[in-house]
């Protein structure tokens, strides 16, 4: 008997979708070997309708995929706009069509719901609203109103113009009656339960003259749509619910055992701990939608999604709900790297971030993760020249080591840098990931002086000591603007005498600048590396003065300046408040994002969920002097 | 919580038909399958068949030592499941165990479905 199991029938209607999953023993082989679905005809044979190595019949162009999901040992068909052509027998199945590794399946396709024996169907989706329409005569005009639903054999009263309502309806239902122009009454249900699907009869008058109108209520649980993902990617659910509960609070649950469905985020402000750091809910749309952000996707986040309405903040009975089913495949195009990066305070750590690397081109951004209200993303640095004010001299962003990883560095690190921060671009969106730094106890490995002043016309030197456990590495002088960091000469000194237990193989690498001069001022970088991949930094601020006595300045560890408290504006720059704009990339569309500075007022977007809070200022040439 | 109630187990002769219905009461807007297992003396519970649904899409799955003589079906309206089960033989003698799921991965595992109902018993003699 064939190893491969399937659904062995499957029956729907035109115009819905099927999902079909087919399973295999896992091994190695199988993993890796061709996947099809296969129509079977009269004659034997079995025609390729889609197959993994990337065929898809024109019968089924632009509606079906085959995806495979080797660590499961199952692949899925999707078939969309089913008609009752597609009625028939198929195989699924591994290698070629005609050897034995297949499972027939068998496919029904039956004519949608219609006006039947003067019924009137309503289709409508659990937790929305149905609006059934009940037509009279004149002369039962001031007659009573009613609806009543079928219960096994007895009609049982919903609603009547009278003023009673069936408990299981209490504050979900009414009954309009229309202007005297139109001899139409209406029952309006919200909120609608599964428990509400069923025959129904609206009624005007009590006799036998009485006006009767049937009508059959299917109440649909909505089909999860099948979402694939790879691991240590990003997926977004995009929800949307309809105007009529545009005021009502959101939440986003996974469903875990039983009929338990645990909040994952939602517009109360609760957020599941698993999530910390990796989840943003966009804010709402005048229309009720929005839109929830996971990065960093874990396999044991995949599961059952819902997206839902409802005054608590979960799911409850009557919920407006969507639904998703989210695979995590775990033979990930993302690279790994840490998900944790440990930084010594006063010290700094450097961030390798992978991206598509079939988009070298597209803008990169570092942005941190702000648990407040719904969560927010604002961007620090991006690869175009932008660093968040607050940040100057101190993060950079390098498109080295490329090749599909960039690298952020940030120095003069302090307990408030502590926290999650996600790695994006504005090309592929399922390439964002999330990397929490820790700052932990410890001592700097690099030994710079504090803040230093150098006179204008003479000569600076500026030590860097570096320990013995960097003997291998590329030792380097930077100076540091808003595009990165530019490599300067130095002078190796020989061994540094600034480290107790440490022998010939520490180094003392001093910085010279000649003629100092105003653009000499700014932050300088002393720091490790291998080929393109960045070690430890150290930062120093060079303030320049008018000369006060001649000679040359050489700077040691112990009589460095006090670097001043505050950065003063350059007269000619207007500080204008950063507006925080809602950040395309990371809700809407999904499309890519236009460069959305304002140049002219040094404003930035920021990758925000909800709040238009002030960003600190943002700077994209030197707008501080000391 | 979601109950399940089997009834319609009985002591049939080989070649005999008989019909099982399982119904579910409780929670069971987000139940997304229900099936059939079964377990003889000293073996383990074996799958023999499920019915999963999306919206108005319905996939059978069965196990190949019964495909051809057992039948799954539902009646939405009643939250029941049914198994007609035809040309009955003395391998069939078991407990027949209804189970439903919320999120099913494989069909044929037992630990992917969250409620059992208490089992019913089907004796084939020959």
């Known amino acids: 008997k064939s190893p491969i199991f399937g659904p062995e029938e499957v029956n729907s209607v035109e115009g819905n979708s099927v999902s079909i999953t087919c399973y295999y023993p896992p091994t190695s082989v199988n993993r890796h070997t061709r996947k099809y679905w296969c129509r079977q005809g009269a004659r034997g044979g079995c025609i390729t309708l889609i197959s993994s190595e990337g065929y898809v019949s024109s019968k089924y162009a632009g509606r079906a995929n085959l995806t495979n999901f080797p660590e499961n040992g199952t692949f899925v068909v999707n078939i969309a706009q089913l008609s009752q052509d597609d009625s028939g027998r198929y195989k699924c199945g591994l290698g070629i069509n005609s050897r034995g590794l297949s499972f027939d399946v068998s496919l029904e396709v039956s004519q949608g719901p219609g006006l039947l024996n003067d019924t009137k169907v309503y289709t409508v989706d659990l937790g929305r609203t149905v609006t059934i329409n009940c037509p009279f005569k004149t002369e039962n005009a001031q007659k009573r109103k009613s609806l009543y639903k079928q219960i096994g054999l007895y009609p049982v009263l919903v609603i009547d113009s009278s003023g009673y309502v069936n408990p299981n309806y209490t504050g979900r239902i009414r009954l309009d009656i229309q202007g005297t122009g139109q001899l139409l009454f209406s029952v309006v249900i919200n909120q609608l339960r599964l428990s509400d699907a069923g025959q129904y009869l609206c009624q005007a008058g009590d006799d036998s003259n009485s006006n009767k109108k049937n009508a059959d209520l299917q109440v649909l649980k909505p089909e999860p749509e099948l979402v694939y993902e790879d691991l240590r990617g990003s997926v977004t659910f995009h929800c949307a619910l309809g105007p009529e509960v545009a005021n009502v609070a959101k939440f986003l649950c996974r469903q875990s055992s039983g009929e338990n469905c645990d909040v994952v985020v939602n517009t109360l402000g609760k957020r599941a701990p698993a999530f910390e750091g990796r989840i943003l809910l966009n804010p709402q749309d005048k229309d009720g939608s929005f839109s929830v952000v996971i990065t960093g996707l874990r396999k044991e986040d995949a599961g059952r999604y819902l997206c839902g309405a409802h005054s608590d903040g979960q799911l409850q009975e009557g919920s407006p709900i969507q639904a998703w089913q989210l695979f995590v495949n775990e033979e990930s195009t993302i690279p790994r790297s840490p998900t944790v990066v440990k930084g010594v305070a006063g010290s700094s750590v450097a961030v390798l971030c992978p991206y598509n690397r079939k988009e070298s081109k597209s803008i990169k951004y570092w942005c941190l993760w702000e648990g407040a209200q719904n969560g927010r993303c604002p961007l620090l640095v991006d690869s175009e020249g932008w660093v968040k004010a607050q940040y100057e001299g101190r993060l950079s962003l390098l498109e080295e080591p490329g090749n599909g990883t960039f690298t952020v560095i940030l120095n003069q690190l302090t307990s408030r840098d502590a926290g999650f921060y996600w790695c994006l671009t504005n090309g592929d969106t399922l390439w964002r990931t999330t990397v929490e730094i820790k700052i932990i106890e410890g001592e700097p490995n690099l030994k710079v002086p504090g803040n230093v002043t150098a006179v204008l016309g003479e000569t600076l030197k500026v030590p860097c000591h570096f320990p013995c456990k960097f003997s291998s590495y590329e030792k380097y002088w930077c100076k540091w603007n808003n595009t990165g960091c530019q490599a300067l000469p130095s002078q190796d000194e020989g061994p540094s005498k600034a480290f107790v237990n440490c022998d010939e193989n520490s180094r003392l690498v001093s910085l010279t600048l000649n003629l100092v001069t105003r653009a000499d001022e700014g932050w300088y970088w002393c720091g490790v590396k291998q080929g393109h991949f960045y070690g430890e930094t150290a930062a120093v601020y060079v303030a320049v003065e008018e000369r006060k006595a001649a000679g040359s300045r050489d700077v040691s560890l112990a009589k460095a300046d006090a670097a001043p408290d505050e950065k003063v504006l350059d007269s000619g720059f207007r500080e204008i408040e950063n507006k925080a704009i809602q950040d395309p990339r990371l809700f809407a569309e999904e499309k890519a994002v236009a460069d959305t500075r304002d140049q002219a007022d040094g404003s930035r977007a920021s990758v925000d969920s909800g709040s238009s809070e002030e960003q600190g200022g943002s700077s994209r040439h030197h707008h501080h002097h000391h | 919580q979601v109950q399940l109630v089997e009834s319609g187990g009985g002591l049939v002769q080989a070649g005999d038909s008989l019909r099982l219905s399982c119904a579910a009461s409780?929670?069971?807007?987000?139940?997304?399958?229900m099936g059939w297992f079964r377990q003889a003396p000293g073996k383990e519970r074996e799958f023999v068949t499920t019915?999963?649904?999306?919206?108005?899409?319905?996939?059978?799955y069965y196990a190949d030592s019964v495909k051809g003589r057992f039948t799954i079906s539902r009646d939405n309206a009643k939250n029941t499941v049914y198994l007609q089960m035809n040309s009955l033989k003395p391998d069939d003698t078991a407990v027949y165990y209804c189970a439903a799921s919320t999120v099913l991965t494989d069909p044929r595992v037992p630990t992917e479905y969250d409620y059992w109902g208490q089992g019913t018993q089907v004796t084939v003699s020959s």
């Open positions: 409780g929670r069971t807007r987000t139940t997304y399958g």
């Open positions: 019915i999963t649904w999306s919206g108005s899409t319905n996939y059978k």
